[in-house]
């Protein structure tokens, strides 16, 4: 929707355009206008952009008013959220950019007799992005000034430049993303693809044989296992056995069977052979032992002279016995072969919690700290290892240690300093904890040990000009006597500044106001109305440019007057014969000065930029893609970093082209699957997906490796009549019109004999971008004057 | 208030074609996914197609893949769907619904009877 | 297809009892669930979703649990209450129900 929102409104006397007054007559002494004040509203029409703004035709893109918001003179800026001063056009376009404005204030008449009133009108061509942020334009001249604000803001979803994009967030089966200020989908945590639809899955979960339909999980297919899905699931009761696809059950190294469960190398598997027998396997779990000498038995473990092998350990003596051996073992050991420590430490001899460990018929205590000795029955002095920090002195306690602490101090080793800030510090000051004491920082604008005094900020008289002084915490204000401002009253306030006078009238500075030094063809508080010289004055024809009057403001006692048959734009020349010519000023030409010259003859907007012109200038309307006076910046498409995953980005014209990275995908390298999604191409493109890279195929009216570049087709023929300029708007245009025409093709001729432009009951004549009075008999110029 | 209407069904033989409508007012049609659900005399809700706001993401349940079609026309703030090839197990009551983060707004129905 | 059980399939209760109504997903459907109310001949209408009461629902009626079970809670059974409620999975396609709990006057 397009936002437009009154400020202010600045109509000093209550006049209206034509001079005259809101309500009634004017005061024959200050001339100035009496009764009640302007009842102010406001229209405004907004429609296609136009080089030079013509006041008729439709309000194509909408039109609103606003009720009375005011009288003469008035100020909205701090009434935030009154909708009285606001109009609000939607529309269910896409927004084209360029537009043209016409905002016009009314009286209102409060009369169903009466019409309302023009006081003052104001037109805009421009260009405006979609945003939150305010534009202000004002309108500094005529009878009344006023300032207004305007933005173009999309409805909810929508979002580019024309407010066509659509995203709405979302968090379902659709789709799990919300929208970026591009009005680009974002993935929430775990979802992947364009429509953010799909589950990443656990990390490491197999892609052939896992799946997951919520992020993080894996899911495994039939026959396959593991937090990954990648372990296939071998045949049921395999037991020495692997598999590489479901149901196998391949055997391991010396395993056999169809479960893989009969041992092949039993001799390998189990090493059954003792004392130094050799084994053969002799079949699937099956094996012999070959004893050397001196043993005997299936597995070579009955020793024929048992003591020949030292079997006793940690230097036990071996006696041989009837049945082998027997062993005595050296203090400290037991068990058959002596290999077995005593456990010392049962029963735990270490008193005061000391913890027992066992060596070799023996045991050491670890003690805690307080404990010392072999048994730790010894009280230890704490105070050897200087725990105090901030004391006088320490004393050693049984099992403990007492320290003395220093004034501020506290705690077991006295290194907590004691928090001395209980609140004595007033007026927000923060404290600051010293060792025995504390010290408070005050707030700009207090002083005192406890921040409990008001500096006093009047005491150096800072007020001028007889202003009053105000203190204030950490503050002084002047309230200044009438005719001083300024934050000391230093300023003389300037009625002049800015000036308020018109037609080049000096403007005095009086005590509470200002008064206007008019020339002599003017009059009015402002020096804004003509005098009609002729009501008082008779005037004589001198040339075909001037007509003379009696003066007493000139030596010579006349005045001399020019026609203004050369318009706006131009001076009147007398020639002989009563013939004249027109010296234009800059940037216009023809009989009248009425035509403006094209400044866009040139070409001078760079890269397929639309030259629109103005007065004695031109505006570029670049393409898509393309930025600056005269369009001559390639815009910066990687700006907002579009390549994900480690992508780089390279920026092209309207677009960008991400070069990916690590076996990533698509138009931002978004996707481990395919090159295309409903994003990678614009503008209703097809996107193929050619393995390494994708192709658009755009419909007609674009181009562009993604169709982002818009054709000239739309333009082309020129669709635009009478000299009017085109420029593309996606698969439209919108023409920009020569002055003299109007609506959507330039087709409608500009009535110029709106306003009213002949007197004293002249008939105009409307013409191309010109008009002529026929005047009724006794008058005659070339506006009947 | 939103009003969901739906329309076109009927007794059809085993084979046959049928197409449903929904007639939507009340919110920004355009703005919304919409779906359609059945419901078997004395049955449960079953899932039947859902369409994304601009139309372009479809989706369907495996009992119907191949034969139904969904759709939507914006401009006319209608939901359809082209059942083709319709067997006994489709008879049902349809409903559409307007699905944001789940269907939220359920039309009357209309019977589809399926039967030679 | 994730796989939605309601127990039980039906209840007896009376006007003022506590009702509460399970359903479990055949795998985590984190919260993404939705509860519906359907009446003899009349169209389903969302009570619940992902734990949230839908705007017009009284407060008597609340969504519990995540991942894999879920309740909805009827904190005083009222005569209007009286109808069939179904759970719904609304994270992967195909979209799948409850077979839906009867509450019946005792």
């Known amino acids: 929707q397009f936002e437009l929102e009154i400020l202010s409104m600045q109509n000093v006397n209550g006049e209206l355009q034509n001079g005259n007054c809101c309500g009634g007559a004017r005061n024959p002494g200050d001339r100035k206008c009496t009764r009640d004040e302007c009842d102010t509203y406001f229209k405004v029409c907004l429609k296609e952009y136009q080089s030079r703004v013509t006041a008729g035709g439709p309000c194509s893109f909408g039109s609103g008013s606003t009720p009375v918001i005011g009288g003469n003179t008035f100020n909205l800026k701090a009434s935030r959220g009154n909708d009285r001063n606001r109009i609000v056009l939607p529309f269910s376009f896409a927004w084209p950019r360029s537009y043209t404005l016409l905002v016009e204030a009314w009286d209102s008449s409060n009369d169903t007799v009466q019409p309302d009133s023009i006081i003052e009108k104001a037109s805009h061509s421009g260009m405006i992005n979609p945003s939150r942020q305010w534009q202000t334009l004002k309108q500094n001249t005529g009878v009344a000034h006023f300032e207004y604000q305007i933005r173009v803001t999309c409805d909810d979803y929508y979002y580019g430049f024309g407010c066509n994009k659509f995203c709405r967030p979302r968090d379902d089966f659709f789709g799990h993303y919300a929208c970026d200020q591009n009005g680009n989908k974002t993935c929430m945590e775990g979802w992947m693809g364009p429509e953010c639809n799909r589950a990443i899955c656990r990390q490491g979960c197999s892609p052939k044989h896992g799946s997951c339909k919520l992020p993080g999980d894996c899911r495994c297919q039939y026959g396959w296992q593991g937090l990954y899905c990648d372990k296939c699931i071998p045949h049921p009761g395999c037991v020495h056995g692997i598999c590489n696809e479901p149901w196998q059950c391949l055997c391991e190294t010396n395993w056999g069977g169809q479960l893989c469960d009969k041992d092949l190398n039993y001799c390998g598997t189990h090493q059954p052979c003792l004392n130094g027998g050799t084994c053969s396997n002799t079949g699937p779990d099956k094996y012999q032992c070959s004893c050397p000498e001196g043993y005997s038995g299936p597995n070579c473990e009955i020793a024929e002279h048992a003591c020949l092998s030292d079997p006793c350990h940690n230097r036990g003596s071996c006696k041989e016995t009837s049945l082998g051996f027997e062993c005595e073992c050296s203090p400290g050991w037991t068990g058959p072969t002596c290999s077995t420590n005593i456990d010392d430490c049962s029963p735990n001899n270490c008193s005061h919690g000391g913890t027992c460990q066992d060596l070799v018929n023996g045991f050491k205590c670890v003690c805690p700290p307080q404990w010392t000795g072999k048994t730790c029955q010894l009280d230890a002095n704490e105070c050897e290892a200087k725990p105090c920090v901030n004391a006088k002195s320490c004393k050693n306690l049984i099992a403990s240690y007492y320290c003395d602490c220093l004034p501020g101090w506290m705690g077991q080793n006295c290194d907590i300093n004691i928090n001395d800030c209980l609140g004595q510090c007033q007026n927000d000051a923060s404290c600051r904890d010293l060792v025995n004491g504390y010290r408070c920082i005050c707030p700009p604008g207090y002083a005192g040990d406890h921040c409990e005094r008001d500096i006093d900020e009047c005491a150096s008289n800072p007020c001028l000009n007889g202003g009053h002084c105000q203190n204030e915490i950490n503050r002084f204000q002047c309230l200044c006597p009438t005719g001083f401002s300024g934050n000391l009253c230093q300023l003389d306030i300037d009625y002049c500044e800015p000036n308020p006078c018109q037609n080049g009238a000096q403007c005095y500075n009086r005590a509470s106001d200002y008064f206007c030094k008019c020339p002599e063809d003017y009059e009015g508080k402002n020096c804004s109305h003509l005098k009609d010289h002729c009501r008082t004055t008779p005037c004589e024809v001198i040339d075909s440019c001037t007509v003379a009057m009696a003066s007493n403001d000139t030596p010579e006692g006349v005045r001399y007057i020019s026609s203004n048959v050369c318009g706006p734009h131009g001076k009147c020349k007398s020639q002989s014969g009563g013939k004249f010519t027109c010296d234009c000023n800059k940037g216009f030409t023809g009989t009248y000065c009425h035509e403006n010259i094209n400044d866009c003859e040139s070409n001078p907007c760079r890269n397929g930029g639309t030259c629109i012109d103005g007065v004695n200038s031109y505006k570029c309307i670049c393409s898509d893609g393309w930025e600056g006076a005269y369009c001559e910046t390639n815009i910066n498409d990687c700006s907002q970093n579009p390549c994900h995953n480690g992508g780089t980005c390279r920026d092209l014209v309207n677009d960008f082209y991400c070069d990916c990275k690590n076996g990533w995908k698509g138009k931002t390298c978004h996707s481990r699957d395919s090159q295309c999604d409903e994003a990678t191409c614009n503008n209703g493109g097809t996107c193929y997906d050619e393995g390494d890279a994708f192709k658009c195929m755009c419909p007609g009216g674009w181009e562009g490796t993604t169709c982002n570049i818009a054709r000239n087709s739309s333009c082309l023929p020129n669709p635009c009549h009478n000299g009017g300029t085109c420029v593309v708007n996606g698969e439209s245009f919108t023409c920009v019109c020569k002055e003299g025409w109007e609506g959507p093709i330039c087709a409608q001729n500009t009535n110029d004999c709106s306003p009213h432009p002949c007197y004293n009951s002249g008939t105009c004549v409307d013409g191309d971008n010109w008009y002529r009075c026929e005047c009724a008999p006794g008058f005659a110029g070339p506006d009947c004057r | 208030e939103v009003q969901l209407l739906e329309s076109g069904g009927g007794l059809v033989q085993p084979g046959g074609s049928l197409r449903l409508s929904c007639a939507a007012s009340?919110?920004?049609?355009?703005?919304?996914?919409m779906s359609w659900v059945r419901q078997a005399p004395g049955k449960g809700l079953e899932w039947v197609s859902s369409?994304?706001?601009?139309?372009?993401?479809?989706l369907y349940a495996d009992s119907v893949k191949g034969r139904f079609t969904i759709s939507r026309d914006n401009s006319k703030n209608t939901l359809y769907l082209q059942m083709n090839s319709l067997r006994a197990e489709d008879t049902a009551v349809y409903y559409c619904?307007?699905?944001?983060?789940?269907?939220?707004?359920w039309g009357q129905g209309t019977l589809v009877t399926v039967s030679s | 297809d994730i796989q939605m059980t309601q127990s039980p399939s039906s209840l007896s209760a009376s006007v003022g009892d506590r009702v509460t109504i399970t359903c479990r997903a055949s795998?985590?459907?984190?919260?993404?669930l939705n509860w519906y109310q359907q009446k003899p001949g009349k169209a389903p209408k969302l009570l619940i979703y992902a734990s949230s009461l839908q705007s017009g629902v009284p407060s008597r009626f609340s969504g519990s649990g995540s991942g894999t079970d879920f309740t909805l809670t009827i904190g005083s059974l009222q005569p209007e209450d009286f109808a069939t409620y179904y759970c719904?999975?609304?994270?992967?396609?195909?979209?799948?129900f409850g077979q839906g709990t009867k509450v019946e006057i005792k």
């Open positions: 795998q985590s459907i984190s919260s993404y």
């Open positions: 719904q999975q609304n994270v992967a396609t195909p979209l799948t």
């Open positions: 619904a307007k699905t944001s983060s789940a269907f939220d707004y």
């Open positions: 009340g919110f920004t049609f355009s703005s919304y996914a």
């Open positions: 369409i994304e706001t601009q139309g372009p993401t479809t």
